[in-house]
Interface confidence: low
Amino acid sequence: EVEKTACPSGKKAREIDESLIFYKKWELEACVDAALLATQMDRVNAIPFTYEQLDVLKHKLDELYPQGYPESVIQHLGYLFLKMSPEDIRKWNVTSLETLKALLEVNKGHEMSPQVATLIDRFVKGRGQLDKDTLDTLTAFYPGYLCSLSPEELSSVPPSSIWAVRPQDLDTCDPRQLDVLYPKARLAFQNMNGSEYFVKIQSFLGGAPTEDLKALSQQNVSMDLATFMKLRTDAVLPLTVAEVQKLLGPHVEGLKAEERHRPVRDWILRQRQDDLDTLGLGLQG
């Protein structure tokens, strides 16, 4: 907390500029008008303030806006955002995607902090759903963002937003999350032709039921083993040897290397040995 002291003669700030970096903390407190700071926030980032000086500037804004900063100020916080606590951010009403992008840019390259998590939470709740533009933005900054949402939260993602999802965005999703996302993806991509559809739906197949895998096996999709290994065990078990052979195409030989791992191991145990022998891979049921 900075003591209230009178501003020395001639030091009253007329604008936010480089001269302020030479002000002591108490001088910043006494000589910088909070309203001036709020209107010239965009200049703060161009000035090499110390973290201690930024603390004073934050304190001034907190006094000016005890109920939370307006978006016009938030959008230009820049590095001052790193000084905000989740409690500060919970008071904000952020509605502009440009504001969100500006603040995510400040934190770029860092782990998702509690501050960023709170900011995203406020923004998404304010919008009511994860629309495509928001999802595009969030996954660009945090590829794992989608998989950090609970299945309940994912259920509010509209199918149209699925177009923004890249395969790497789903790398860390667990089966229950894919269970929610898969039907949305199927809906989103339903008008695509066979080969294009498979390219798009492939990353979501960890949530696919048996009947969809059976349908895919009729499409000459040549699923790779990495995708097959991510399928739900309960969805793979009912597939026949012929269906798995059609589903994998030339990749069927890869089953041998994975015979001790789920879901391949469990699937093998469900098959008749005669059927397995038709693959010529030496798989033992």
Epitope: D121, C147, T172, Q177
Partner: nanobody, 120 residues
Framework: QVQLVESGGGSVQAGGSLRLSCAAS????????MGWFRQAPGKERERVAQ???????TYADSVKGRFTIARDDAENTLYLQMNSLKPEDTAMYSC??????????????WGQGTQVTVSS
Amino acid sequence: QVQLVESGGGSVQAGGSLRLSCAASGYTVSSGCMGWFRQAPGKERERVAQIGRDATTTYADSVKGRFTIARDDAENTLYLQMNSLKPEDTAMYSCTAYWGVYCLSPGRYWGQGTQVTVSS
């Protein structure tokens, strides 16, 4: 429905040990990030330790070297081994589970908590 049930709390003398457990249902402990928080009467909730999906662990400075967080994937349970306990460790300890790689704050799911009391 996700449920987290803590156990293992109790009263202990300073210097003693306790092992807290958090049994999860409807949630796979290896699928996301999990953590332990504590709250003493009249104090704010404090993050004690957390373990990421990749099993990376982090601790509050006040418990480093004394507490160990671990999970047992087979038992689907999170643990907090607390050694060299001090009176200031007295609090209600709650486990929390997050979805995904980010330990978003606050936790997505909370247990009811288990009381730990350390007397001098």
